[in-house]
Amino acid sequence: VPDKTVRWCAVSEHEATKCQSFRDHMKSVIPSDGPSVACVKKASYLDCIRAIAANEADAVTLDAGLVYDAYLAPNNLKPVVAEFYGSKEDPQTFYYAVAVVKKDSGFQMNQLRGKKSCHTGLGRSAGWNIPIGLLYCDLPEPRKPLEKAVANFFSGSCAPCADGTDFPQLCQLCPGCGCSTLNQYFGYSGAFKCLKDGAGDVAFVKHSTIFENLANKADRDQYELLCLDNTRKPVDEYKDCHLAQVPSHTVVARSMGGKEDLIWELLNQAQEHFGKDKSKEFQLFSSPHGKDLLFKDSAHGFLKVPPRMDAKMYLGYEYVTAIRNLREGTCPEAPTDECKPVKWCALSHHERLKCDEWSVNSVGKIECVSAETTEDCIAKIMNGEADAMSLDGGFVYIAGKCGLVPVLAENYNKSDNCEDTPEAGYFAIAVVKKSASDLTWDNLKGKKSCHTAVGRTAGWNIPMGLLYNKINHCRFDEFFSEGCAPGSKKDSSLCKLCMGSGLNLCEPNNKEGYYGYTGAFRCLVEKGDVAFVKHQTVPQNTGGKNPDPWAKNLNEKDYELLCLDGTRKPVEEYANCHLARAPNHAVVTRKDKEACVHKILRQQQHLFGSNVTDCSGNFCLFRSETKDLLFRDDTVCLAKLHDRNTYEKYLGEEYVKAVGNLRKCSTSSLLEACTFRRP
């Protein structure tokens, strides 16, 4: 019988008492085969973290700063359940740390030196740790003691709780630096008042502070937010302009064997029975013998943290950067206006080898990072382990939802001004063998299908989106008799046709021979009835253009396209017989890397792009013998996006809507995690 006990860690007598009450009340409402609570008492949160890591306890609820400590080795804990505030309909699990300024003040984030600052309090998250952590490498050296460096950075401050004797500049705007509400500039409202009164130029608070202090929109309009990309935005656009997105209070558990499903089962049942306004005798979110015991008194309930979410993703790149800077106190040697090498994310061994070749030839401008799947790469870019990669539109969508931005687009047509003219897109098509003359768009049910990969544009999002509109369910593996759609569940019929060996079967990378455009076409040639690819795939792999044994004798005339009206046409008539227009693949990165990725990639394509005539004697960035490694092989150049610099603008309303509709069929664990952070 599996042990269904969750050992909760308590950090005080009062918490232990509430934990015992929690345990007893849960026993009275949950059947004996259900989850139960045991209580473990420790002296501090850090002791609780160590106890969970050592398997002496299972769970504890922590503030963001401690979630970071819990994640660090050797603890390796992960967030499993989040408290939410507000209503069940609009649950708030995060707050945003923001920098508020007056509208007419005219400076940006990178011009804060010499300004006057208002802080909620020394050592507090939104008011100190996050802004000072993010500004850390701009502080004058020596950066220790930190208070002295901050005092020398700003021309005056109010940082309640600072030592006014040792650091008088930190108390210049609020004499005495009192550490309670007796100091009119203490806390969130106090720091905002410090700005409002004109004492300071910038206030570091949370996004709700301004709404709580100014009910009138006209008054709020006198203020703006400073964004990390050195722009400003209105105060209600905090989701797109903040210093960090911070989780409020989170239950953590072990990453391996951490009982996360059991903890959720327990807390979900607990909130049903003892949540807000549920029971008189025991209340989960109430602390008669103290404040915020086990859970925050202001919490309204729990939400399960998606399993794909590790602590780094949950806390977010900005928060982790800020806290790491403060804790480790290390800054890059290089002057900050110089671009560091771009860390390119490569999928599997084939891409890594090409990336390494690029790295050597780039003379230190490009470094390489490996991941097994596109989603793993996106996650690495999010958390700073990697910086950039080129993605199919379907993954540009996921990357965009995860906060990444498109920076350059692949262009596939030769033109005089390639780099300045991003193209309208390519065509997603359905290819069949000419010999299968009875096959049309209307009778694909029960046939064998070949897809580039799950989540990709031409191979999945467009055909499956159209199919979904017809069949109104997501069981695509029942619609086709079998197929190869790399990235499907291994036991799915949509992995049956795949050719990868062992663990590589149906993997969404080049270890699966039927992956990508060329792979999906090969799947059609060897086993399938229909392949969902791009309009250039057939000509690129026929007529001797692909020398691989399976392709070298293929003839374009032996294949036809399925049109949506139920007819068929020759391959070259794709403009009048396609499923949809697809946005070109694009390079994505984090917002903070946008300028450097743009600059370095434009240099790199001038060195190794289509202008290189002899690819047998020189490194060519856009060539890999039809394998589309790192970039599509038919890329002519990487083009500027001009104003199409967000994922929505880049992909276009129609495509975003189409992928959004298919979201209910999504198996993307990363998309689930990212929409948890930003619904």
Epitope: D356, S359, V360, N361, V363, G364
Partner: nanobody
Framework: QVQLVESGGGLVQPGGSLRLSCVAS????????VIWYRQAPGKRRELVAL???????NYRESVKGRFTISRDDAKNTVWLQMNALEPEDTGVYYC??????FGQGTQVTVSS
């Protein structure tokens, strides 16, 4: 001007071994890494192995576990130790570093 000279090739039976060397004249050799390529008759030139300045190495899948690339900066030399050779390894082997043209290469023939 740095020049690269490859040597160590020859005729060897399947299962045999060879050690290729790539020697550079001039200074600053391999500061950004060195790559061994090979070209079989009628085929495209393909990357075999590479070594970066920090000692990081990578290999094409078909030679992994059989070939080892190493370097000695004091001798301005990069080696390619090739074991368990197969007929498919036949070709002209070249070493390359950024900014330096290809050398003459060294012929490796694996045949019984």
């Amino acid at each position: 001007q740095v020049q690269l000279v490859e040597s160590g090739g020859g005729l060897v039976q399947p299962g045999g071994s060879l050690r290729l060397s790539c020697v550079a004249s001039g200074s600053g050799f391999g500061i950004n890494g060195v790559i061994w390529y090979r070209q079989a008759p009628g085929k495209r030139r393909e990357l075999v192995a590479l070594i970066k300045s920090d000692g990081y190495t990578n290999y094409r899948e078909s030679v992994k576990g059989r070939f080892t690339i190493s370097r000695d900066d004091a001798k301005n030399t990069v080696w390619l130790q090739m074991n368990a050779l197969e007929p498919e390894d036949t070709g002209v082997y070249y070493c390359k570093t950024p900014g330096v043209p290809f050398g003459q290469g060294t012929q490796v023939t694996v045949s019984s």
